[in-house]
C-alpha cells in the first residue's frame, strides 16, 4: 500500500517517499523504485539553507557598496551572505538591504548607546547635573563642572546644553 505520510527529511511523490536534498544541494530528479533522489551542489554564489526539494538554488545576497553595504560574512552553499554597513552607517532593517547615516544626538542630549552596523544611535536627554553642547554620535552627557572642588562658586547655573560657569568667591571685606 502506498504511503500517505513520510519520515522527516523525506517527501511524498508518485506514491513513494523520496529523500529531500541536503542543505547546499538542489533537486535534479525525484527518486524512483530503482534509484534515490538525485541532488546536485549549488553553484558558485548560490545557496540552499534547508533540507529541500528546490530545483533552483537561491542567489547569495549582494552587498551593494552604493547603498553603503559591505560583506560581514561570505555566503556558503548552505548559508546566505550577511551584509553590514560601512563605518558610520547602520542597516535600515533586519534584512540589512540598505544603510543610513548614524543619527547624532542634538545639544541637550547625549549618546546612551553608540550605533552599530545594525542599530542606530540611542540618545537620552541630559538629566539635571549633566549637559551636552554638541551634536554628536559618540558624546555622552557630561557632568557639570564642580565649582566647589576648585574652590570656586557658581556664577552661572548650568543647563542641559551648557556647563556651569564658575567664578572666584567674594572676599570678605
Amino acid at each position: 500500500e502506498p504511503p500517505t505520510a513520510c519520515r522527516e527529511k523525506q517527501y511524498l511523490i508518485n506514491s513513494q517517499c523520496c529523500s529531500l536534498c541536503q542543505p547546499g544541494q538542489k533537486l535534479v530528479s525525484d527518486c524512483t523504485e530503482f534509484t534515490e533522489t538525485e541532488c546536485l551542489p549549488c553553484g558558485e554564489s548560490e545557496f540552499l539553507d534547508t533540507w529541500n526539494r528546490e530545483t533552483h538554488c537561491h542567489q547569495h545576497k549582494y552587498c551593494d557598496p552604493n547603498l553603503g553595504l559591505r560583506v560581514q560574512q561570505k555566503g556558503t552553499s548552505e548559508t546566505d551572505t550577511i551584509c553590514t554597513c560601512e563605518e558610520g552607517w547602520h542597516c535600515t532593517s533586519e534584512a540589512c538591504e540598505s544603510c543610513v547615516l548614524h543619527r547624532s544626538c542634538s545639544p541637550g542630549f547625549g549618546v546612551k548607546q553608540i550605533a552599530t552596523g545594525v542599530s542606530d544611535t540611542i540618545c537620552e536627554p541630559c538629566p539635571v547635573g549633566f549637559f551636552s553642547n554638541v551634536s554628536s554620535a559618540f558624546e555622552k552627557c557630561h557632568p557639570w563642572t564642580s565649582c566647589e572642588t576648585k574652590d570656586l562658586v557658581v556664577q552661572q547655573a548650568g543647563t542641559n546644553k551648557t556647563d556651569v560657569v564658575c567664578g572666584p568667591q567674594d572676599r570678605l571685606r
Partner: antibody
Framework: QVQLVQSGAEVKKPGSSVKVSCKAS????????VSWVRQAPGQGLEWMGM????????SYAQKFQGRVTMTRDTSTSTVYMELSSLRPEDTAVYYC????????WGQGTLVTVSS | QSALTQPPSASGSPGQSVTISCTGT?????????VSWYQQHPGNAPKLIIY???KRPRGIPDRFSASKSGNTASLTVSGLQADDEADYYC??????????FGGGTKLTVLG
C-alpha cells in the same frame, strides 16, 4: 516507472536544423531534469546539455552553445532538442535521459546529415 | 570540458574480475561524488549500473562495484559472465550544471 519515448529517425541536409522530441510518461514530468546525449557511429557518448522542465532552465555543453536549443511543453510532457547548422559530423544517435544521473533513457533517434 | 580518460579495452575470462579506471581532474571526478557508470550493449541505449560513485540501482547485481580515489574512479566487474561483454562509460558532474563522459571501454569476455 518513467518511460521516455523519442521521435523517429531523420535525414537532414547540411546547414539545416533538426528537432528531436522526447515524450515522458510515468512519474511527474516537472520533477526531473532531462539530459540530451549523442553518440556518433562507432564513437563514445557525448553530453549535450540539459533542461529542467519545472522552470524550463537550460544548461548546454560549451561545444554546442549557440547551436542547440532545448525546450519543453508541459501540457504534453515532452521535451525537445533542436540542433541547427547541421554538418555531416552531427550524424549520430541522439538520446534523451532522465536527470544528470541518466537512470532512464529514451530508445534513441538516428539523425543522418548528408547532402 | 575534456573527456574523462578510460582505457579503450579490457578483458577477462568468465568468473574472473576486471577493473576499469576513469581518470578526470580536481574539477570533476575529484571535486564531486557524482560519478556514474553505464553499460551499453551494441544497438541498445546505455544502462545505468552505478551512480553517486558506488551506489547500485535496484536490480543491478552486486558483481558490479565501484569506488573513487582522488581524481580517479574505478568500476570492478567480478565473476565475469558472457553477458557482461559490452561498452562501459563513466560520467562525472563537472560543476556549473555540466557533465562529462569518459571515452568508453570495450570489455571482452574471453573464451
Amino acid at each position: 516507472q518513467v518511460q521516455l519515448v523519442q521521435s523517429g529517425a531523420e535525414v537532414k541536409k547540411p546547414g539545416s536544423s533538426v528537432k528531436v522530441s522526447c515524450k515522458a510518461s510515468g512519474g511527474t514530468f516537472s520533477s526531473y531534469a532531462v539530459s540530451w546525449v549523442r553518440q556518433a557511429p562507432g564513437q563514445g557518448l557525448e553530453w549535450m546539455g540539459m533542461i529542467n522542465p519545472s522552470g524550463g532552465t537550460t544548461s548546454y555543453a560549451q561545444k554546442f552553445q549557440g547551436r542547440v536549443t532545448m525546450t519543453r511543453d508541459t501540457s504534453t510532457s515532452t521535451v525537445y532538442m533542436e540542433l541547427s547548422s547541421l554538418r555531416p559530423e552531427d550524424t549520430a544517435v541522439y538520446y534523451c535521459a532522465r536527470g544528470f544521473r541518466m537512470d532512464q533513457w529514451g530508445q534513441g533517434t538516428l539523425v543522418t546529415v548528408s547532402s | 570540458q575534456s573527456a574523462l580518460t578510460q582505457p579503450p579495452s579490457a578483458s577477462g575470462s568468465p568468473g574472473q574480475s576486471v577493473t576499469i579506471s576513469c581518470t578526470g581532474t580536481s574539477s570533476d571526478v575529484g571535486a564531486y561524488n557524482f560519478v556514474s557508470w553505464y553499460q551499453q550493449h551494441p544497438g541498445n541505449a546505455p544502462k545505468l549500473i552505478i551512480y553517486d560513485v558506488r551506489k547500485r540501482p535496484r536490480g543491478i547485481p552486486d558483481r558490479f562495484s565501484a569506488s573513487k580515489s582522488g581524481n580517479t574512479a574505478s568500476l570492478t566487474v567480478s565473476g565475469l559472465q558472457a553477458d557482461d561483454e559490452a561498452d562501459y562509460y563513466c560520467s562525472s558532474y563537472a560543476g556549473n550544471n555540466n557533465l562529462v563522459f569518459g571515452g568508453g571501454t570495450k570489455l571482452t569476455v574471453l573464451g
